[in-house]
Amino acid sequence: VSVETQAYFNGTAYLPCPFTKAQNISLSELVVFWQDQQKLVLYEHYLGTEKLDSVNAKYLGRTSFDRNNWTLRLHNVQIKDMGSYDCFIQKKPPTGSIILQQTLTELSVIANFSEPEIKLAQNVTGNSGINLTCTSKQGHPKPKKMYFLITNSTNEYGDNMQISQDNVTELFSISNSLSLSFPDGVWHMTVVCVLETESMKISSKPLNFTQEFPSPQTYWK
């Protein structure tokens, strides 16, 4: 049996172990345990009782077992918890273990990026360019791209997209910058910053610019 599940960063992951062969076998007759891809044990339920001595230190205090639907809850999920988990339902006679069922769960962890925020690097004056920076923080998985959209244009603008990853949390932050000037005859512009991930597009609040006086020097960068 193989399943996929998703959890939010700092949230709870649900690792199921549906015992399709249950019939007349009760939890008190079984050994049920979960292990990660490094074979480290997250939780063990031994003949009806929690068994903590086999649990790896990194999972101690982070799990709870729902005996009604045979699901392990993994709390305070971190990016490093991504990966595969096996649940084993076993019997342990004197002749050695018998696996009655094995369920593989593939866990992915997501963190919503903050709403992209456009910041103005300097005041807008008639004959100077506008320098903008857009940032979005603490998301996962790695974003695809970030760009600026400008009034009445379908082009994607941006000079310097940078993605960084926090060494501890493994969350991503992304920024992009743009330098622009008012084109000839344009007195008003609206700029929006868009972050694209695998699953969604997130837009910043629009930023409006009005030119203070006509500028003879008009150009895009």
């Epitope: 006679p93 002749t95 018998i98």
Partner: antibody, heavy 115, light 113 residues
């Protein structure tokens, strides 16, 4: 889909050796005990040997102890049965099976020990 | 060694009939630690590999029709086929995996009249 496929057996003279293999697929081989069972022509089933999931423990029936060796390669997902000093009474179809509960079986391979 | 005795050695029944076969072990297969009986039943059709029907004395393997019923505890076990079908023609073996060496019964041959 779980599959167990034994290698070809054959005719072997008494006192000689033969190595059987069983290629496993469709499950995490390294998590499961594995066994060999045999069946002489027109006879019943007879357990031969069992090996633990990691290969650290092996168990044999008395009549093959010291002559047969069960082993496994978890990287290649193959189970082996090395049969030495073969006797006529070892003539049988040999099956590999998953676990001592034998929930999956190979198709079987015939081994004939005769001069 | 635990000796497994199966009776009868053969049995002929008509389709639709109920059939029972017995398996007795020379010592108890009930494991006190988990209160489980470590006995399995297998079906072997002519020219085929055996197939697991019942494990832990009474738990039906996935995909096995519910006309196959395992019962018993300790040393006395029974396999019942509530309404025999033509495709049930086969040899039936019980097996203990409570102790090494693992042992099988000598089998019950089911023939259809």
């Amino acid at each position: 889909e779980v599959q167990l496929v034994e290698s070809a057996g054959g005719l072997v003279q008494p006192g000689r050796s033969l190595k059987l293999s069983c290629a496993a697929s469709g499950f995490t081989f390294s998590d499961y005990y594995m066994a060999w069972v045999r069946q002489a022509p027109t006879k019943g089933l007879e357990w031969v040997a069992t090996i633990s999931h990691d290969g650290s423990s092996t168990y044999y029936r008395d009549s093959v102890k010291g002559r047969f060796t069960i082993s496994r390669d978890n990287a290649k997902t193959i189970l082996y049965l090395q049969m030495d000093s073969l006797r006529s009474e070892d003539t049988a179809t040999y099956f590999c099976a998953r676990q001592n509960i034998m929930d999956y079986w190979g198709q079987g391979v015939m081994v004939t020990v005769s001069s | 060694d635990i000796v497994m005795t199966q009776t009868p050695s053969s049995q002929a029944v008509s389709a639709g009939e109920k059939v029972t076969m017995s398996c007795k072990s020379s010592q108890s297969l009930l494991y006190s630690r988990d209160q489980s009986n470590y006995l399995a039943w297998y079906q072997q059709k002519p020219g085929q590999s055996p197939k697991l029907l019942i494990y832990l004395a009474s738990t039906r393997e996935s995909g096995v029709p519910d006309r196959f019923i395992g019962s018993g505890s300790g040393t006395d076990f029974t396999l019942t086929i509530s309404s025999v079908q033509a495709e049930d023609l086969a040899d039936y073996y019980c097996q203990q995996h409570y102790n090494y060496p693992l042992t099988f019964g000598s089998g019950t041959k089911l023939e259809i009249k």
